[in-house]
């Protein structure tokens, strides 16, 4: 889980070691702050859980792409 050391900076210290189904992901944000030990992506799931993931992993990149496309698609 992400850890807010000194708000408003949130850092990830561990990454999930399992793929999370892309259909369970609602949004993401990138963590690039120099105050954090590593770059990360924090996914928020459809039930509002926050999960730290490694931006170098392909499934993480695919998931971000999927969410980006979803955001661009107008709702009918």
């Amino acid at each position: 889980q992400p850890d807010a050391i000194n708000a408003p900076v949130t850092c990830c210290y561990n990454f999930t070691n399992r793929k999370i189904s892309v259909q369970r992901l609602a949004s993401y944000r990138r963590i690039t702050s120099s105050k954090c030990p590593k770059e990360a992506v924090i996914f928020k799931t459809i039930v509002a859980k926050e999960i730290c993931a490694d931006p170098k992993q392909k499934w993480v990149q695919d998931s971000m792409d999927h969410l980006d496309k979803q955001t661009q698609t107008p709702k009918t």
Partner: antibody, heavy 119, light 113 residues
């Protein structure tokens, strides 16, 4: 194509434990979340628990908490479900089921394992 | 926990006639951001594991005949078999996969009248 192959039928006495296996093939094991669903004779489907990557751990239905343990052996791509303190009401077919990265629902099921609890 | 309630419990329909099964969730299983309902329908025949028919409430699984259709949104869902065939005799279950614990309806048995 994911394939789930389960161990054979078991007959157990009340109070004993049973361990059912589910071998996964056709997919990278660690990319799947395996769940267990049971069905008592003439009854409906009941979710027992499974690995939840959102929590990073195995979660169990409250009804089975403390009596069920689900483990995995990544060297053999096999998942196990152990149910202890068996009673006659645990007589059921036990299924393993999984979803892949692009789904989220159970699109693959094992063939089922009948566990009979009888004295 | 989200409770799934199916109706009716059983249904007898003449060959070629329409069968309609309802499923109600105790809370909405629609995620508005992606406009998806986290609901599936399964068909189960004796001695077999459940077979996926419909996912996202209305999308037919590959290979499922087009006489099967799913509809509904939010908390109310329907599975329709437009022209019942002998091979459709089975028990049908809805299931939500919005939040754990994943829960099933109690099942609807479809028979030939």
């Amino acid at each position: 194509q994911v394939q789930l192959v389960q161990s054979g039928a078991e007959v157990k006495k009340p109070g004993a434990s049973v361990k059912v296996s589910c071998k996964v093939s056709g997919h990278i094991f660690t990319e799947l979340s395996i769940h267990w669903v049971r069905q008592a004779p003439g009854k409906g489907l009941e979710w027992m628990g499974g690995f939840d990557p959102e929590d990073g751990e195995t979660i169990y239905a409250q009804k089975f908490q403390g009596r069920v343990t689900m483990t995995e052996d990544t060297s053999t791509d096999t998942v196990y479900m152990e149910l202890s303190s068996l009673r006659s009401e645990d007589t059921a077919v036990y299924y393993c089921a999984t979803n892949d990265f692009w789904s989220g629902y159970f699109d693959y099921w094992g063939q089922g394992t009948l566990v009979t609890v009888s004295s | 926990d989200i409770v799934m309630t199916q109706s009716p419990g059983s249904l007898a329909v003449s060959l070629g006639e329409r069968a309609t099964i309802n499923c109600k969730s105790s809370q909405s299983i629609l995620f508005r951001s992606n406009n998806k309902n986290y609901l599936t329908w399964y068909q189960q025949k004796p001695g077999q594991p459940p077979k996926l028919l419909i996912y996202w409430a209305s999308i037919r699984e590959s290979g499922v005949p087009d006489r099967f259709s799913g509809s509904g949104s939010g908390s109310n869902f329907t599975l329709t078999i437009t022209s019942l065939q002998a091979e459709d005799v089975a028990i049908y279950y809805c299931q939500q996969y919005y939040s754990s614990p994943w829960t099933f309806g109690q099942g609807t048995k479809v028979e030939i009248k």
